[in-house]
């Protein structure tokens, strides 16, 4: 990475809303995120033909700070901030805004750095997009099978 890019964006404390999100709120956010996530993944796969299925990144999915199945917004958001300059910024911006609603006060934001190697970087982005899509499906299924 070039020296000029060593500008650490991380760790700002986030005052989460006092009220807990209801399952219906979480479902609504996930239903907004789902098409955006799928679209990004499909576009990326079209652009980067021949990339293997990736297990490069281990994107955190669920939050431990909740009784409900709850996406870990604090942990996932930095991945999307990291890949924004290498992806469709307008869709990523919408994802960032939705993920911000899913943040809990007690969860600090992780620091994510992009692999410098070209192939590794492409794998990293693919892994983030694939695992995020899978995470959304998993949480949506749990919400749908749980109490309404």
């Amino acid at each position: 990475m070039r020296g000029s890019h060593h500008h650490h964006h991380h760790g700002s404390s986030h005052m989460a809303p006092a009220h807990r999100l209801q399952p219906s709120d979480i479902r609504k956010i996930i239903l907004e995120l789902r098409p955006m996530s799928k679209g990004l993944l499909q576009d990326y796969l079209k652009k980067e033909i021949g990339l293997p299925e990736s297990n490069h990144s281990s994107l955190p999915c669920l939050s431990s700070d909740s009784q409900l199945p709850h996406i870990n917004g604090s942990a996932i958001l930095p991945y999307f901030r990291a890949i924004r300059p290498l992806s469709d910024k307008n869709t990523i911006d919408k994802i960032i805004e939705q993920l911000d609603k899913l943040k809990f006060q007690r969860e600090p934001e992780a620091k994510v750095s992009m692999p410098a190697d070209n192939f590794e970087r492409k794998n990293f982005i693919l892994a983030v997009l694939q695992q995020f899509s899978a995470c959304l499906e998993h949480v949506l299924q749990s919400l749908n099978s749980g109490p309404q």
């Epitope: 070039r2 500008h7 964006h9 760790g11 999307f80 990291a82 300059p85 910024k89």
Partner: antibody, heavy 121, light 111 residues
Framework: QVQLQQSGAELVKPGASVKLSCKAS????????INWVRQRPEQGLEWIGW????????KYNETFKGKATLTTDKSSSTAYMQLSRLTSEDSAVYFC??????????????WGQGTSVTVSS | DIVLTQSPASLAVSLGQRATISCRAS??????????MHWYQQKPGQPPKLLIY???NLESGIPARFSGSGSRTDFTLTINPVETDDVATYYC?????????FGAGTKLELK
């Protein structure tokens, strides 16, 4: 929708200081750089510096070090630029503009309307 | 610092014709396999408006008459066909390396 609202025009005396503001709305302020750009009359665009509201990190163009100081107030989603020891050379329109979200600089996709600063005795 | 040289400085094009503006960087603005070159339009008394980001991506809400191409050091903004509303000054800008720099601008007029 994303908006950056800048403070009004300033007429200041040589040697004085001025503090310009840029209030952001329509997005989560702390995740995006705020850039400041100068445009002198009938001239092009010059980048002054950026500030990342999340951690207060800043980077300045060498030309503006000691001239501009960038700060933010996360509670009001406002970025500020203080210009000190003003001379007639500092008479210009100053823009704030939203940048990227990561260590990789990106395009400035939303701009404030600009604040005109006139330095005159 | 990366110096951006825009050409021509001014350009007169007939309505409905193609306008081509060039931007040459003093060193490569590519990183991570992406060109960090962006194009803006500015009309008198207004702030710049992002048209194209990362060399070839059309910003949301910008008409498809605008397109960008190029990599490393040579970039082009094309407007085809030119409309009355396109009379403005166009700037290229690189974000690969601090300090961020702009080209001197190209003034587009109608013939």
């Amino acid at each position: 929708q994303v908006q950056l609202q800048q403070s009004g025009a300033e007429l200041v005396k040589p040697g004085a200081s001025v503090k310009l503001s840029c209030k952001a709305s329509g997005y989560t302020f702390k995740y995006y750089d705020i850039n400041w750009v100068r445009q002198r009359p009938e001239q092009g665009l010059e980048w002054i510096g950026w500030i990342f509201p999340g951690d207060g990190g800043t980077k300045y163009n060498e030309t503006f070090k000691g001239k501009a100081t960038l700060t933010t107030d996360k509670s009001s989603s406002t970025a500020y630029m203080q210009l000190s020891r003003l001379t007639s050379e500092d008479s210009a329109v100053y823009f704030c503009a939203r940048g990227g979200t990561s260590v990789i600089r990106d395009a400035m996709d939303y701009w404030g309307q600009g604040t005109s600063v006139t330095v005159s005795s | 610092d990366i110096v951006l040289t825009q050409s021509p400085a001014s350009l007169a094009v007939s309505l409905g014709q193609r306008a081509t503006i060039s931007c040459r960087a003093s060193e490569s603005v590519d990183n991570y396999g992406i060109s960090f070159m962006h194009w803006y339009q500015q009309k008198p008394g207004q702030p710049p408006k992002l048209l194209i980001y990362r060399a070839s991506n059309l910003e949301s809400g910008i008409p498809a008459r605008f397109s960008g191409s190029g990599s490393r050091t040579d970039f082009t903004l094309t407007i085809n066909p030119v409309e009355t509303d396109d009379v403005a000054t166009y700037y290229c800008q690189q974000s690969n390396k601090d300090p961020l720099t702009f080209g001197a601008g190209t003034k587009l007029e109608l013939k």
